[in-house]
């Protein structure tokens, strides 16, 4: 039945990197120079993306796959198959319509991109802060208060150790 | 400009064996699916066998033990191997390329069959 | 395999004249045919495939018509080039058949 279904649609013969040429009597012809056909059956090719601008080239388009682009240096890339490029910001800031702006206090970013995101409040699990936040980096939760009354240890146990030269199962 | 230029035809006697060739150009050879048609003197058309791009094949039922189907598409050729030839094998064989629809057809090559 | 019957044998017109030509099919083949036309001495070329669809180059004095069992292949206007031997060949279904042949002739 398979055989059939191609003999009845010609064009489903045609293979990925090739169109089903209509002005050819339906052969299959090659992609014309910066498109691409990444499945058979094709009746036309689709046009190579370009990578421009902001945009560089991460890989060439070829007959059977389009090109994929990432972004220049102090950009990152947004959406499926990096469609959009984003200015990056510094670690400790966030990107606004009015540009780079530092994280407000109480907030960090510890990434070139994204947005200030809220220190994490160690108090809702119990715990105290250990080490306080900054713009670039969250703040560190150690033990809760009562952890740490006379006679409690704050140091953790040391792991068992293991026969030197031989890996853990 | 589609070109399809058969050889290898000729006279050969009953049980014989002759291999037929079809030098294709002006298109993607390895991309299309070949037939092979044969006309006997004064008849009509009738299909032969296909080939796909990648080298599957179709027969007519009433000749695929004798006949054998091949491409090579590093050479942009077609071939036909016909064994234990009869005299109503006899007929110009055509190349054609096309699946269902064959597009563009050679000129043809005679192959006689005759004591 | 699909049997194909052309009619009819031979079709005497003159030039200038409408040409018609039947394909009837032994089963339903949908429009999965093709039409050829071919001169003496010469390769057969496609004409129509698709039942409907012109062939590159083909003047659209020639048009497809049919679906299913019964196909014809319409010359509106015969011009002296046109008299020859016509086919038609189903490819719905293994093995490809093609009918036995219309001759038109200049009457």
């Known amino acids: 039945f398979e055989r059939t279904r191609s003999l009845q649609d010609p064009c489903s013969n045609c293979p990925a990197g090739t169109f089903c040429d209509n002005n050819r009597n339906q052969i299959c012809s090659p992609c014309p120079p910066n498109s691409f056909s990444s499945a058979g059956g094709q009746r036309t090719c689709d046009i190579c993306r370009q990578c421009k601008g902001v945009f560089r080239t991460r890989k060439e388009c070829s007959s059977t796959s389009n090109a994929e682009c990432d972004c220049t240096p102090g950009f990152h890339c947004l959406g499926a198959g990096c469609s959009m490029c984003e200015q990056d910001c510094k670690q400790g800031q966030e990107l606004t319509k009015k540009g780079c702006k530092d994280c407000c206090f109480g907030t960090f970013n510890d990434q070139k991109r994204g947005i200030c995101r809220p220190w994490t409040n160690c108090s809702l699990d119990g715990k105290s802060v250990l080490v306080n936040g900054t713009k670039e980096r969250d703040v560190v939760c150690g033990p809760s208060p009562a952890d740490l009354s006379p006679g409690a240890s704050s140091v953790t146990p040391p792991a068992p150790a293991r026969e030197p030269g031989h890996s853990p199962q | 400009e589609v070109q399809l230029l058969e050889s290898g035809g000729g006279l050969v006697q009953p049980g014989g064996s002759l291999r037929l060739s079809c030098a294709a150009s002006g298109f993607t050879f390895s991309s299309n699916v070949m037939n092979w048609v044969r006309q006997a003197p004064g008849k009509g058309l009738e299909w032969v066998s296909e080939i796909s791009h990648s080298g599957s094949t179709n027969y007519n039922p009433s000749l695929k033990s004798r006949f054998t189907i091949s491409r090579d598409n590093s050479k942009n050729t077609l071939y036909l191997q016909m064994n234990s030839l009869r005299a109503e094998d006899t007929a110009v064989y055509y190349c054609?390329?096309?699946?269902?629809?064959?597009?563009?057809w050679g000129q043809g090559t005679l192959v006689t069959v005759s004591s | 395999e699909i049997v194909l019957t052309q009619s009819p044998g031979t079709l005497s017109l003159s030039p200038g004249e409408r040409a018609t030509l039947s394909c009837q099919a032994s089963q339903d083949i949908s429009n999965y045919l093709n039409w050829y036309q071919q001169k003496p001495g010469q390769a057969p070329r496609l004409l129509i495939y698709g039942a409907s669809s012109r062939a590159t180059g083909i003047p659209d004095r020639f048009s497809g018509s049919g679906s299913g069992t019964d196909f014809t292949l319409t010359i509106s206007r015969l011009e002296p080039e046109d008299f020859a031997v016509y086919y038609c060949?189903?490819?719905?279904?293994?093995?490809?058949?093609f009918g036995q042949g219309t001759k038109l002739e200049i009457k």
């Open positions: 060949q189903q490819y719905n279904s293994y093995p490809i058949t």
């Open positions: 054609a390329v096309g699946a269902g629809n064959l597009g563009y």
